[in-house]
Each structure stands twice: as C-alpha cells, then as structure tokens.
C-alpha cells in the first residue's frame, strides 16, 4: 500500500493490501477504498469497463467475467489498483477473437486467464494442424499471450490459447491472425505506353498499373511542372495475399495542343517511392 | 551473451528430493524464457520444465507435473528446480536453458533455446 507523506496528495488505499487477488466462483468480492478525496471505482477487463462511485465494490456472487483490473481514484487523480482473478474450472479464458498484427510488430492475442495458477498457458494450432516453428510468445496471464515478430507467413494463422487442467488440455475459442505487411520494397509501377502522338480532337488514355503488397499503398497522376488536378480512373485486385494491383487511367477525351508534355504517375509507401512517366505530344489538325 | 551456471545436482534416496539452481548472468528482459532439460546415458535431451521471466507462467512435461516445481528470482537472475518423489528414472544429466526470443510455441523443442549451461549430474539411486 503507498506511503502517506504529509501536505502531499498521495494515492487511495485498497483492502485487501495486495496487488492479485484469487477468489472463486459464487464466492463474494468485497473491496474497500480509503480516501477522503474518492471519486470512484473503475473495473476493466478487455474492451469493457464499468465505474462503481460507492467507495466499496461488493459483487455477492462473482464470476469468471468479473475477472480484471479494479482500479480507485481519487479527487486528485492518483489512483490504486488490485487485480482479481475469478477462478472458473468450466471458464478459463476470457477472450476476445479480434487477432490483427502488423509484420513484424508484436500482436496480442487477447485471452487473460481466470486462474493465474494453471500451467502450460501457451498456444496451439487448431485441429492439431503444427503452428511455425518460429513462433514465439510471451505470456501474460491479465492480457493475453504476445507474439512476438509478426511473419508475413503467420497470415490466415488459425489458433487456441491453451492451459494445462488436471492433466488435459484446455483449449479456448479460435483466433484468426490478420496479418498487415509491412512495405519493405517501394510499389512497381508501369506505363501502358511510353510516349503518344496524338491530333488535336483526339482521346487521350493513358494507364499506370501500381503494384504493391497492400492496398494502403498511394498512388497519383500528374502533370510535370503543373498543379493542375488531373481527372483519373481506378480499377484495383487482389491477387492472393499481399499482392495488390491498382490501375489509374488518366483520360483526356479532346486533347489540345497545350496538354503536350510529360505525365507522372507516381506511387509511394511507408518504404519509398517509385514513378514513372509517359510523354504526350498533341499537333493540330493541319 | 548469456552464461547459465546450474548447481545443486547429486546423489539421492529414490522419494528424496533435490533443488537445482541456474544462474544467468547479463540482463534478464520480458522476452526471457529459462528452462530445464535432461539426458540419461544414450537417450535424447528432453524437456522437464520451463518459466516465462515476465509474468512467471510455468510448463512442465507431464512426466514430471506434481512432482517438480519451477520458479524463478528475478532480483537474482536464478531459476530453481524443485524436484520431490524423486524416481530411478529421473536420473540424467540437468541442462539448464535460455533464450531471449520469448518462449518458443514448441518449448518442449531443445533445439529453439540458445544458451545452455555446462548440466548438473543427478543420480537416484532404488
């Protein structure tokens, strides 16, 4: 519990005194906060969160979901925290199933723990298919277990988080892994033509194929030495996983004289950028 | 680079119990995972049991569940072995393991842990 010093604010004080608490379900959870300056309680466990202004929680007959953080502030903003953890043998996971990770960033998979005393808390592939080789986690028994270094390959990756009961394995609901790439080369880019001789009157269309790993890669046309916004069309595929095609036409249906000049099609990422142009030359009808 | 020195290996009374202890030195992170092996003479190097250096989350081999507790001394940079009901069989040299990657999705696997120590000899005599 903290330390008062006098004249200075100092945080609330729980009871019980300690940072977990265990206790199991259909049994009552009872915690004090002392503080002249209370505000409130506020519990969070994954995305949800509950506030409490009475300045004792009592919830008679807990459950696994009353598993997680307890938290009370005071009018100063300094608050105090205890974890309790809603031993459930018919519930061990809390979970929720959203499982997104950028490549080569560390993704969590969200399934806490309502006993934090079970054993083997690790991952397992579903329907006994292996998981890779390289995967390697770090588990957290009030967050989840942590992937480390996300792998482009980990993409479409089906799992459980898994515990160690009374000489079983306890499997939770499946996770989906979404992977995001990471852009590690700048886009291709192509031209359908390289250069256009055109009467004046005539259509001019021009298409730049983008290629990329994913869709959030940008791209644009446009007019050397000029501001002007150009008129384009897009057409965009997915061929497979992380291989993202994007076609920007750029039309100009009457072409004149003064449109002559050199085109860019340009595209960038959080890699780089690549363009390429084409050169329009419009002679008058004579 | 990471140095693993284990200690508290011998000779025991089948039903007796042992403490191994492994000392790393360097720096402990999150990602730290320590664990323990074991090979008897002209068996392969299997897994006993192992522990996650942030939160502490324990995996043990089921032949070894209910009789071997691993923890860990994080001011100490140590993890221990405790090993009761000691069997004949749990005779083998104790290979004390590390790796700073995170534990591995297939921890039991020797083969993915990247520092070792020298082992402990443990005897248990019928």
């Known amino acids: 519990q903290p330390s008062v010093s006098p004249g200075e604010p100092s945080p609330p004080s729980i009871h019980p005194g300690k940072s977990d608490l265990i206790v199991r379900v259909g049994d009552e959870i009872r915690l004090l906060c002392t503080d002249p300056g209370f505000v409130k309680w506020t519990f969070e466990i994954l995305d949800e969160t509950n506030e409490n202004k009475q300045n004792e929680w009592i919830t008679e007959k807990a459950e696994a979901t009353n598993t997680g953080k307890y938290t009370c502030t005071n009018k100063h903003g300094l608050s105090n925290s205890i974890y309790v953890f809603v031993r459930d043998p018919a519930k061990l996971f809390l979970v929720d199933r959203s499982l997104y990770g950028k490549e080569d960033n560390d993704t969590l998979v969200r399934c806490p723990l309502t006993d934090p005393e079970v054993t083997n808390y690790s991952l397992k592939g579903c329907q006994g298919k292996p998981l890779p080789k390289d995967l390697r986690f770090i588990p957290d028994p009030k967050a989840g277990i942590m992937i480390k270094s996300v792998k482009r390959a980990y993409h479409r990756l089906c799992l459980h988080c898994s515990v160690d009961q009374e000489g079983k394995s306890v499997l939770s609901e499946k996770f989906i892994l979404k992977v995001r790439p990471a852009f590690k080369a700048v886009p291709v880019v192509s031209v359908s033509k390289a250069s256009y001789l055109l009467r004046e009157g005539e259509e001019f269309t021009v298409t730049c194929t983008i290629k990329d790993v994913s869709s959030s890669v940008y791209s644009t046309w446009k007019r050397e030495n000029s501001q002007t916004k150009l008129q384009e069309k897009y057409n965009s595929w997915h061929h497979g996983d992380f291989n993202y095609e994007r076609q920007a036409t750029l039309t100009i249906s009457s072409a004149r004289v003064n449109d002559s000049g050199v085109f860019m099609c340009y595209a960038n990422n959080t890699f780089g950028s690549a363009n390429v142009t084409t050169t329009l030359e419009v002679v008058d009808k004579g | 680079e990471v140095q693993l020195v284990e200690s508290g290996g011998g000779l025991v009374q089948a039903g007796g119990s042992l403490r191994l202890s492994c000392a790393a030195s360097?720096?402990?992170?999150?990602?730290?995972?320590m664990g323990w092996f074991r090979q008897a003479p002209g068996k392969e190097r299997e897994f006993v049991a192992a522990i996650s250096w942030s939160a502490g989350m324990t995996y043990y081999a089921d032949s070894v569940k209910g009789r071997f507790t691993i923890s860990r001394d994080n001011a100490k940079n140590t993890v221990y072995l405790q090993m009761n009901s000691l069997k004949p069989e749990d005779t083998a040299v104790y290979y004390c393991?590390?790796?700073?990657?995170?534990?591995?999705?297939?921890?039991?696997?020797?083969?993915?842990?990247?520092?070792w120590g020298q082992g402990t000899q443990v005897t248990v005599s019928s």
């Open positions: 360097g720096r402990t992170s999150g990602s730290y995972v």
């Open positions: 393991a590390a790796d700073q990657r995170g534990v591995p999705a297939y921890y039991s696997d020797y083969a993915l842990y990247d520092y």
